[in-house]
Interface confidence: low
């Protein structure tokens, strides 16, 4: 179920799958929610630790049991991912942090009259992920009212420093507030060039596009279909970026599909989940559990309810069925995508709906922390 | 909202505008989306307007002036006014609206979490009131959704300010001693929300106050935590399944 409780002065021991810098516990929780394996997180505010390297540290954690031992650590904040929390799931983060400088690659500097205007500029710039603004009272006069637009390899700051009269925040593109607008078109038989930022396996171009949309550095993508001439590249989804923000070139290429991230869409973003079920397809991955259920929809529901399950395969092979029930293979991988996709099988596959935000899960549930 | 500022898109995605379409169409009250098919508002919004077919509910909007005849709206399937509400009193100022069709959730249209039943222990320090209501006592409805940050005041303090009224435990008050920031006419039924542990909760429903934003006259809100049993009973009995965002 959905757990929204935050544990003050507590730190989860072990289970680390990733770490980054975030300005507060809520942003850390959001990163955990969108990380394919993260179930728990611990955050160290500046006041909680003397080690400058670990200040603002956000530690994403996984656990086979769904929990980890808590150790007392003054000032630390820990909590759960919101993966099963329905409409609470959002990559939108509006807060502005006063007295904090979020470091990254500064690619644009301009003078603006307010931090809100700086945030708006970041939101309306295709490459901007976060920003810092030097206020009217900043100690160095020449930097006052400077708006620095930034990005980083992981989409989070490379460091966060306490600095008076500086205010920082994130782009509001995930809030569907960008003025840029987006290209909804899918280009058949066209491959985009430029820099690959990630490679995943997906069953179709639409899943590829959604993954691109929620990847911090993906601006456009190329998907190689299951009939692509090179077998090892079939179902490969290449997430791409470029200096200009658009593909520098595109090549006509049979059995490829290309398109753009939808992060810059106005008013509506795709849900960060994939609800379609793919008949005759087998998703490979690490086995989490195998259970007998009646029908593929129940298999998907079972996967959704098991928080660590990322995708599933429902087998219809006679040896995998007992009366009306057949085997439901619950699976996971390092990046949340299948490690292989096989066609022509007797069964169906699909993804967990744990990140769908339309669910009627009890998204506001809280559990009192036991002592 | 008096002393407020413009909201931005998706900042308060649970806020809805309750409008009446007779010959002309007008915004009358606010409300809060609490489930795919449920809106929570104030009972007094229906004083003299109990007919559900005259109401139009707009969700996922920021600017009332953007509403045209083509703007989609929800219609009311059922109005459930608290059984103890009386037009002549301020008590039990709470009503549920069941929509004819469920709404999909988006960044601009999604529900607010409800508090735990009888929530008295939580100390809320970051509370906001939103609405399209008057920006001064003798004002007009605003086009852009307004927001204002207002501190909660204790019921004891509130009772001192309203000696002629009974401030019950089922009410919650919010305001500044010096006034200047408050809800006003047209904000009724809308949300008083507080952020706690990174999560927004619906603490109050805008109900009444002496004028608007007056010194030492806080706004009075229906305390949602006190009505959780009623909300759950009505939403469950209506279709056998709780459809709002409710804590366990």
């Amino acid at each position: 179920g959905c757990l929204t409780q935050l544990y003050e002065n507590a730190f989860f021991r072990g289970g680390d799958v990733a770490s980054m810098y975030t300005p507060n516990a809520q942003y850390c929780q959001m990163r955990c929610t969108f990380h394919p394996r993260c179930l728990l997180f611990s955050f160290l505010p500046a006041s909680s630790i003397n080690d400058m390297e670990k200040r603002f540290g956000c530690f994403l954690k996984d656990s086979v049991t769904g929990t980890l031992p808590k150790v007392h650590r003054t000032g630390a904040v820990s909590g759960h991912s919101l993966k099963q929390c329905g409409h609470q799931i959002s990559a939108c983060h509006r807060d502005i942090y006063k007295g904090v400088d979020m470091r990254g690659v500064n690619f644009n500097v301009s003078k603006v009259s307010s931090v809100e205007e700086c945030q708006k500029r970041c939101t309306s710039n295709i490459r901007c992920q976060f920003f810092s603004y030097a206020t009217q009272t900043f100690h160095k006069a020449e930097y006052r009212n400077n708006c620095l637009l930034k990005y980083s390899p992981g989409g989070t700051p490379t460091a966060i420093k306490v600095l008076s009269n500086v205010e920082s925040g994130f782009s509001l593109k995930p809030c569907a507030l960008s003025e840029i607008g987006c290209h909804m078109n899918i280009f058949q038989h066209l491959a985009f060039s430029d820099v690959d930022v990630a490679r995943v396996l997906t069953p179709d171009a639409f899943v590829c596009r959604t993954i691109c949309t929620y990847h911090p550095n993906c601006l456009f993508f190329t998907f190689y279909t299951n009939v692509w001439k090179i077998e090892s590249q079939r179902n490969v989804c290449l997430l791409k970026t470029s200096e200009s923000g658009t593909p520098s070139s595109s090549t006509p290429q049979e059995n490829t599909i290309s398109g753009y991230s939808l992060l810059t869409c106005k008013r509506t973003l795709p849900e960060p989940c994939h609800s379609k079920i793919y008949p005759g397809v087998d998703f490979g991955g690490e086995e989490l559990n195998v259970t007998f259920v009646k029908g593929v929809n129940v298999c998907q529901e079972t996967c959704t309810k098991m928080i660590r399950c990322q995708f599933f395969t429902y087998s219809l092979l006679p040896e995998d069925c007992k009366e009306e029930k057949c085997k439901c293979f619950l699976r996971l991988s390092m990046d949340g995508s299948p490690t292989r996709i096989a066609y022509g099988t007797q069964g169906s596959s699909g993804y967990s709906l744990r990140l769908c935000n339309t669910g009627d899960n009890s998204v506001c549930t809280t559990k009192t922390s036991t002592r | 909202i008096v002393g407020g500022t413009n909201s931005s898109w998706g900042e308060w995605p649970w806020q809805v505008s309750l409008q009446v379409k007779l010959t002309a169409q007008r915004h009358l009250c606010g409300g809060s989306l609490i489930g795919h098919q449920w809106v929570l508002t104030a009972a007094h919004c229906f004083d003299g307007l109990p007919l559900q077919d005259v109401w139009r509910i707009y969700s996922g909007i920021l600017n009332l002036s953007d509403i045209t005849k083509d703007t989609p709206f929800s219609q009311i399937k059922e109005i459930i006014i608290h059984q103890n509400y009386k037009v002549s009193e301020g008590n039990h100022d709470i009503a549920l609206i069941k929509l004819q069709a469920p709404l999909n959730y988006t960044e601009f249209q999604k529900p607010i979490c409800l508090p735990s039943k009888g929530d008295t222990s939580t100390i809320y320090t970051n509370c906001w009131v939103t609405g399209w209501g008057f920006s001064k006592e003798k004002g007009e409805i605003q086009n852009i959704l307004q927001k204002v940050n207002i501190p909660l005041v204790t019921n004891e303090e509130c009772q001192k300010r309203y000696q002629d009224y009974k401030i019950t435990q089922r009410m919650v008050c919010a305001g500044y001693k010096e006034g200047g920031k408050d809800a006003c006419k047209g904000d009724s039924g809308g949300p008083l929300v507080c952020k706690h542990n990174g999560m927004w909760r619906l603490v109050g429903i805008t109900s009444w106050g002496e004028g608007c934003a007056r010194r030492e006259q806080p706004g009075v809100y229906t305390k949602v935590a006190e009505y959780m049993d009623w909300i759950l009973e009505k939403t469950q009995s209506s279709d056998g399944k709780a459809q709002m965002q409710s804590p366990a």
Partner: antibody, heavy 122, light 106 residues
Framework: EVQLLESGGGLVQPGGSLRLSCAAS????????MMWVRQAPGKGLEWVSG????????VYADSVKGRFTISRDNSKNTLYLQMNSLRAEDTAVYYC???????????????WGQGTMVTVSS | DIQMTQSPSTLSASVGDRVTITCRAS??????LAWYQQKPGKAPNLLIY???TLESGVPSRFSGSGSGTEFTLTISSLQPDDFATYYC????????FGQGTKVEIK
Amino acid sequence: EVQLLESGGGLVQPGGSLRLSCAASGFTFSHYIMMWVRQAPGKGLEWVSGIYSSGGITVYADSVKGRFTISRDNSKNTLYLQMNSLRAEDTAVYYCAYRRSGVPRRDAFDIWGQGTMVTVSS
Amino acid sequence: DIQMTQSPSTLSASVGDRVTITCRASQSISSWLAWYQQKPGKAPNLLIYKASTLESGVPSRFSGSGSGTEFTLTISSLQPDDFATYYCQQYNTYWTFGQGTKVEIK
């Protein structure tokens, strides 16, 4: 500027009928409970009738119940008082009124029209 | 029905005087009482509502007090512009006016 302008008054015989109008401007008419109040020559004020914002609820003083009908047209920003079976004691200046800031919801009247004179005499 | 009784019906006073008008309700109306001023040939003007709340723009020499059934309107220092008729009005259950108090020059 907020204004209420009554019209329709005049001389009418006992048992006759008259329809008063009150044209509102400068405010969102459909949001407010509207009232009719009258004042007989040299006498005090008497509340006559009230109508809620939608027109769905109407209330009357005992002295006019069954004879007078209050109504409104929100699209025309106009309040009406249909007076039937008029009597000599209905002779008065008739005012329409409303209160602008309606929270709490039981309120006094702070905006009045200039009034229209109704004389019932044979 | 709730009846409102004002006293006195006429009051003679001079500029600078402190003037008090009382209003009695036939049953408790809490603080749901308003005071109006009316000049000949004009519509009434709201002075005070909820027994003691001064309407915006009304001079502070006017004040109201009381609750339940007994109410008073006080003019702390009568000014030339204050010679008029004053009405109380209850709005606890519908609306009823007192019969009025005429304040005239002594």
